[in-house]
Interface confidence: low
């Protein structure tokens, strides 16, 4: 099942994330994602965790998962590249590299996105973009278009009550509020975007979507940007 | 008060293991890393590695991956490190130390245990 | 790795005078950088962080300033209890790492 959904947001302007990615498993949406280089898309470890035998790709410049766009490129996958020390029952270290299979062909509706090298935190209560294509209600419903929401970041403090995440959120982590607007399921591996620089990562671990006592959380990339510098030389 | 209570000083053989306790006090357990430190005259700090004490998500220098495992016990607020295939270089003072946040953002190492020292001779 | 050099592993000083230790980074890690100070047979004490924010109850005597690669720790007037070992780290990306230390002695 896709891994993550916004939640009380709207459908995004077609194609103003030239950045957006979607991991497709089997040629259906499975998890966002984010375009980091020409070559290089960055996402959440667990989403490939079910993928075992499954054809991993990655879809670029669409707005519609099913309409033809022009801009649309289905990419195969060359090399998934998990954080080496994701493991499956933590949300710690939640990150994937996949290199695509060529260079994507960049332009309007595809172009990378700059990330956080400097590792300090995102002052609490600043605005910043989350989208995907995980569903947009309880029921379940999935949208074809890209949807997307603003989020006012959460400070650590609060996100780490024992009424909240429970001192889970460490350092590398972030959360976002959750009252009504949120991501979630399958909106795993997409972009937290503050300031027009990637923030975040939306993790995929489990967690009740839409509560305010249950922030949403996100992997911080500066904290791993050694790492993904690495993969990337 | 926050304290970190280490466990006492290890004389082993080569090739021998070691577990090393830093028992944690005065703050929730759960809510920031432990991170392990090595002090040698020759090779002056290091940063071993951490662990996220709420889920047992570990990060470790690859320098050490291959020699510490580290581990906690969240009913005791304890972390341990395990050293093993110890030789004369990891003879060392090794420090437990908890992250340390200003405006949410981890800046360094705030509380250190004692140290544990570790001397490795046949 | 990002490494943190402190080229002098020694420095004398005397009671009442301006000390200034220097740290250098293999790359720009924007003003991420911490220093300790570590007295014989204890254990490291943090007294700056983000290069220019005193720990609490760190006196205003010790400052931190630079960025870019380069790091200076000054102590404006050197007290006996100063002596001690100084690191600086980098808290900018893992794996964190430290300087070589530099010692401050008295003349």
């Known amino acids: 099942p896709p891994r993550g959904r916004i939640l009380g947001g709207r459908e995004a302007e077609a194609h103003a994330r030239p950045y957006m990615a979607s991991v497709q498993l089997n040629g259906a949406h499975l998890c966002g994602g984010v375009l980091v280089a020409e070559q290089w898309v960055l996402s959440a470890a667990h989403c490939l965790e079910d993928a075992a035998d499954g054809k991993v790709q990655v879809l670029l410049g669409a707005h519609s998962l099913s309409q033809p766009e022009p801009s649309k490129r289905l990419y195969d996958v060359l090399r998934a590249v998990p954080h080496p020390d994701s493991q499956p029952d933590t949300i710690d270290h939640d990150l994937l590299l996949l290199q695509l299979s060529e260079k994507a062909t960049l332009g309007p509706a595809v172009r990378p996105l700059p990330w956080q090298r400097v590792d300090r935190d995102v002052a609490p209560g600043t605005l910043c973009d989350v989208a995907g294509w995980g569903i947009v209600n309880h029921a379940g419903r999935r949208p074809d278009s890209l949807q997307h929401v603003l989020l006012p970041v959460l400070d650590r403090a609060t996100c780490n009550r024992r009424t909240h995440h429970d001192g889970a959120i460490t350092e590398r982590l972030m959360c976002a509020e959750s009252n009504r607007r949120d991501s979630c399921k399958g909106d795993s591996g997409g972009p937290l975007v503050c300031g027009g620089v990637l923030e975040g990562v939306v993790t995929s671990g489990s967690r009740v979507c839409g509560n305010r006592k249950k922030p949403g959380i996100y992997t911080r990339v500066a904290s791993y940007a050694a790492w993904i510098d690495s993969v990337l030389a | 008060e926050v304290q970190l209570q280490q466990s006492g000083p290890e004389l082993v053989k080569p090739g021998a293991s070691v577990k090393i306790s830093c028992k944690a006090s005065?703050?929730?357990?759960?809510?920031?890393?432990m991170n392990w430190v090595k002090q040698s005259p020759e090779k002056s700090l290091e940063w071993i590695g951490d662990?996220?004490?709420?889920?047992?998500?570990?990060t470790y220098n690859q320098n050490f991956k291959a020699k510490a495992t580290l581990t906690v016990d969240k009913s005791s607020s304890t972390a341990y490190m395990h050293l093993k295939s110890l030789t004369s270089e990891d003879s060392a003072v090794y420090y437990c130390?908890?992250?340390?946040?200003?405006?949410?953002?981890?800046?360094?190492?705030?509380?250190w245990g004692q140290g544990t020292l570790v001397t490795v001779s046949a | 790795d990002i490494v943190m050099t402190q080229s002098h592993k020694f420095m004398s000083t005397s009671v009442g005078d301006r000390v200034s230790i220097t740290c250098k980074a293999s790359?720009?890690?924007?003003?991420?950088v911490a220093w300790y100070q570590q007295k014989p047979g204890q254990s490291p004490k943090l007294l700056i962080f983000w290069a220019s924010t005193r720990h609490t109850g760190v006196p205003d005597r010790f400052t931190g300033s630079g960025s870019g690669t380069d790091y200076t720790l000054t102590i404006s007037s050197v007290q006996a209890e100063d002596l001690a070992l100084y690191y600086c780290q980098q808290h900018y990306s893992t794996p964190w790492t430290f300087g070589g230390g530099t010692k401050l002695e008295i003349k």
């Open positions: 790359q720009d890690v924007s003003t991420a």
């Open positions: 662990i996220n004490p709420s889920t047992g998500g570990t």
């Open positions: 005065g703050y929730s357990f759960t809510a920031y890393y």
């Open positions: 130390a908890t992250t340390y946040y200003s405006g949410n953002s981890y800046v360094g190492f705030a509380y």
